[in-house]
C-alpha cells in the first residue's frame, strides 16, 4: 500500500495527476461507518467541502483525494476530517517550465562519489496500474533502455554520469493522457573516502619521571573530522585527582584532514602512577588504534633500552 501523505507542506507542478492520502487510512472498519469529509480553504474562501461535483478534476476514493490533474488554482490548505481525527496539508501548485522537460523547483539533488554504486529506478507505486509506459531522460534527451515499464540505471558512477535525470510516467485516465515527472540532479564528486587515522610516534612509550614532579603525555594523530581521540587509564577515568585530560587541539591540514593533539597531564607523580598503562586511543568508523605510555622512575632507566624512551 502506498504511504500516506504525512508532509504538511507540499509543492507540486501544474498539469500533473496528484493525490493526498490521509494517515488514518488503515482504520478500515471505522472508515466504512464514519462520515468523512475533505475541505479546502484558500484566501477569502473558508473551508469549502470538496466532492466530485466541486470539479470534474477531483475524485474521492476511501482515503484519497485525487486531482486529474492539479492546477494552479488548487493552491491552498486542505483538510481531512473523520470523527475527531483531522489532518491538514498546505498545497502549493507551481508553474510548469514550458521550455524544459522538468521544473527546476521540483528537483531532488543527489551527490554520488565516483566509482561508487549509482542507481536510478523509475517507479510510481500509486499510479502503477494506470501507467502505460515510462521513459527516462538525461538532460531532457531520452535514454534507450530495455525496460519501458520501470527504466533503471545501475552502475558504478563516472564523472560523465552527472546531469538531470527525469523519469516520465505516461498514464491514461478517463480517456485522457497525463504524465508525471520526477527529476534527480545527480552530481558526481571525487572519492571522499576517509583516511585511516594515524597515531604519530611509537606504539609503546616509556617516559622517565621523578616522583613529586609533573609530566605531560602528548598524544597526536592525523584524523578525519568525526574521529575521536581520548585517554584511557586506571579502572575508571577521573578517579585520580592528579590526572587531567587537557583540551584537544585541532589544526586542519591542507588536504582537509585534521592534526589533533591531546595532552594527559599527571601532577605530583606518585608510586601509583608508575608502571601502569596510560592508553591514548583514536577511534574512527574504520576502527581503533591505540598507543601506550608507561611512567618509569628515572633511577630505573638503565634497565630499559634507550630507543624506547620519550622525554
Amino acid at each position: 500500500a502506498e504511504s500516506c501523505t504525512s508532509r504538511p507542506h507540499i509543492t507540486v507542478v501544474e498539469g500533473e495527476p496528484f493525490y493526498l492520502k490521509h494517515c488514518s487510512c488503515s482504520l478500515a472498519h471505522e472508515i466504512e461507518t464514519t462520515t468523512k469529509s475533505w475541505y479546502k480553504s484558500s484566501g477569502s474562501q473558508e473551508h469549502v467541502e470538496l466532492n466530485p461535483r466541486s470539479s470534474s478534476r477531483i475524485a474521492l476514493h476511501d482515503c484519497v483525494l485525487e486531482f486529474w490533474p492539479v492546477e494552479l488554482n488548487d493552491t491552498g490548505s486542505y483538510f481531512f476530517q473523520m470523527k475527531n481525527y483531522t489532518q491538514k496539508w498546505k498545497l502549493n501548485v507551481i508553474r510548469r517550465n514550458k521550455h524544459s522537460c522538468f521544473t527546476e523547483r521540483q528537483v531532488t539533488s543527489k551527490i554520488v562519489e565516483v566509482k561508487k554504486f549509482f542507481q536510478i529506478t523509475c517507479e510510481n507505486s500509486y499510479y502503477q496500474t494506470l501507467v502505460n509506459s515510462t521513459s527516462l531522460y538525461k538532460n531532457c534527451k531520452k535514454l534507450l533502455l530495455e525496460n519501458n515499464k520501470n527504466p533503471t540505471i545501475k552502475k558504478n558512477a563516472e564523472f560523465e554520469d552527472q546531469g538531470y535525470y527525469s523519469c516520465v510516467h505516461f498514464l491514461h485516465h478517463n480517456g485522457k493522457l497525463f504524465n508525471i515527472t520526477k527529476t534527480f540532479n545527480i552530481t558526481i564528486v571525487e572519492d571522499r573516502s576517509n583516511i585511516v587515522p594515524v597515531l604519530l610516534g611509537p606504539k609503546l612509550n616509556h617516559v622517565a619521571v621523578e616522583l613529586g614532579k609533573n609530566v605531560r603525555l602528548n598524544c597526536s594523530a592525523l584524523l578525519n573530522e568525526e574521529d575521536v581521540i581520548y585517554w584511557m587509564f586506571g579502572e575508571e577515568n577521573g578517579s585520580d585527582p592528579n590526572i587531567h585530560e587537557e583540551k584537544e587541539m585541532r589544526i586542519m591540514t591542507p588536504e582537509g584532514k585534521w592534526h589533533a593533539s591531546k595532552v594527559l597531564r599527571i601532577e605530583n607523580i606518585g608510586e601509583s602512577n608508575l608502571n601502569v598503562l596510560y592508553n591514548c586511543t583514536v577511534a574512527s568508523t574504520g576502527g581503533t588504534d591505540t598507543k601506550s605510555f608507561i611512567l618509569v622512575r628515572k633511577a630505573d632507566m638503565a634497565d630499559i633500552p634507550g630507543h624506547v624512551f620519550t622525554r
Epitope: S193, V196, I229, Y230, G286, T288
Partner: antibody, heavy 115, light 113 residues
C-alpha cells in the same frame, strides 16, 4: 550491491565453539570496522565488540572478553567471530554490522546452544 | 561504561499522531572538538536486522522518510515520528558510539493504539 552476507545457522552443544563469517561486498572493506551484535530470543541488542578491518585491532565487551576472537581476512573481505565455551545463554541471532553507527547489517546467524 | 536508558519501554500511538521516544546516556556523548553527538537510532521489525534511521543524533539516513527526526545533545536525546503510519510498528533502539564498549538502549516497542 553493498551488503554483508553471513554464514548459516548453527546448533552447538554447551562447551563447544562456533565461528560465524560475514562477507562484505561492493565497498572498500578496510574503510570500515566490523562490529558484532547479538540478540537473544525476545531480547534487545547487545554489542559484543568490533575489529578494525585496516589493522586488525579489536575491542571486546567485558561480558564476552576471553571467550571471543574477532578476525578479518582482507583478501576475501570477510570478518569472522569465534565464540568459545558456549553456554545456553549464548543462544542468539548474531549480526555483523558496518562502521560505528551501523548503516549496513548482515541478515543474522542463529546460533542455538543446547544439550 | 556508558549506559543508555530509553523511555518508555512501550508506547501505543494512534495512526497519524506523533510518537516520541527518549534516550538518556549515563555520560555525555557530545564531542567538544567537533560538536558532534555520537548517537544513532535504529528501527527493528520482527525477523529482520535493525535498520539505521538517524546518526550524529539528528542526521537522517538516506532513504528514511522525513517523518522520522532526531534531536537532543549531550545526554538527552529524542526520536520523533511526526505522523505515525502502520509500517512504523517496530522496536526502536538508541546506540552510543562515543566510547567502547558501544552500547544500546533496552529498546522501545511502538504499537498502534
Amino acid at each position: 550491491q553493498v551488503q554483508l552476507v553471513q554464514s548459516g545457522a548453527e546448533v552447538k552443544k554447551p562447551g563447544a565453539s562456533v565461528k560465524v563469517s560475514c562477507k562484505a561486498s561492493d565497498y572498500t572493506f578496510t574503510t570500515y570496522g566490523i562490529s558484532w551484535v547479538r540478540q537473544a530470543p525476545g531480547q534487545g541488542l547487545e554489542w559484543m565488540g568490533w575489529i578494525s578491518a585496516y589493522n586488525g585491532n579489536t575491542n571486546y565487551a567485558q561480558k564476552v572478553q576471553g571467550r571471543v576472537t574477532m578476525t578479518t581476512d582482507t583478501s576475501t573481505n570477510t570478518a569472522y567471530m569465534e565464540l568459545r565455551s558456549l553456554r545456553s545463554d549464548d543462544t542468539a541471532v548474531y549480526y555483523c554490522a558496518r562502521g560505528w553507527y551501523f548503516d549496513l547489517w548482515g541478515r543474522g546467524t542463529l546460533v542455538t546452544v543446547s544439550s | 561504561d556508558i549506559v543508555m536508558t530509553q523511555s518508555p519501554d512501550s508506547l501505543a500511538v494512534s495512526l497519524g499522531e506523533r510518537a516520541t521516544i527518549n534516550c538518556k546516556s549515563s555520560q555525555s556523548v557530545l564531542y567538544s572538538s567537533n560538536n558532534k553527538n555520537y548517537l544513532a537510532w535504529y528501527q527493528q521489525k520482527p525477523g529482520q536486522p535493525p535498520k539505521l534511521l538517524i546518526y550524529w543524533a539528528s542526521t537522517r539516513e538516506s532513504g528514511v522518510p522525513d517523518r522520522f527526526s532526531g534531536s537532543g545533545s549531550g545526554t538527552d536525546f529524542t526520536l520523533t515520528i511526526s505522523s505515525l503510519q502502520a509500517e512504523d510498528v517496530a522496536v526502536y533502539y538508541c546506540q552510543q558510539y562515543y566510547r567502547t564498549p558501544y552500547s544500546f538502549g533496552q529498546g522501545t516497542k511502538l504499537e498502534i493504539k
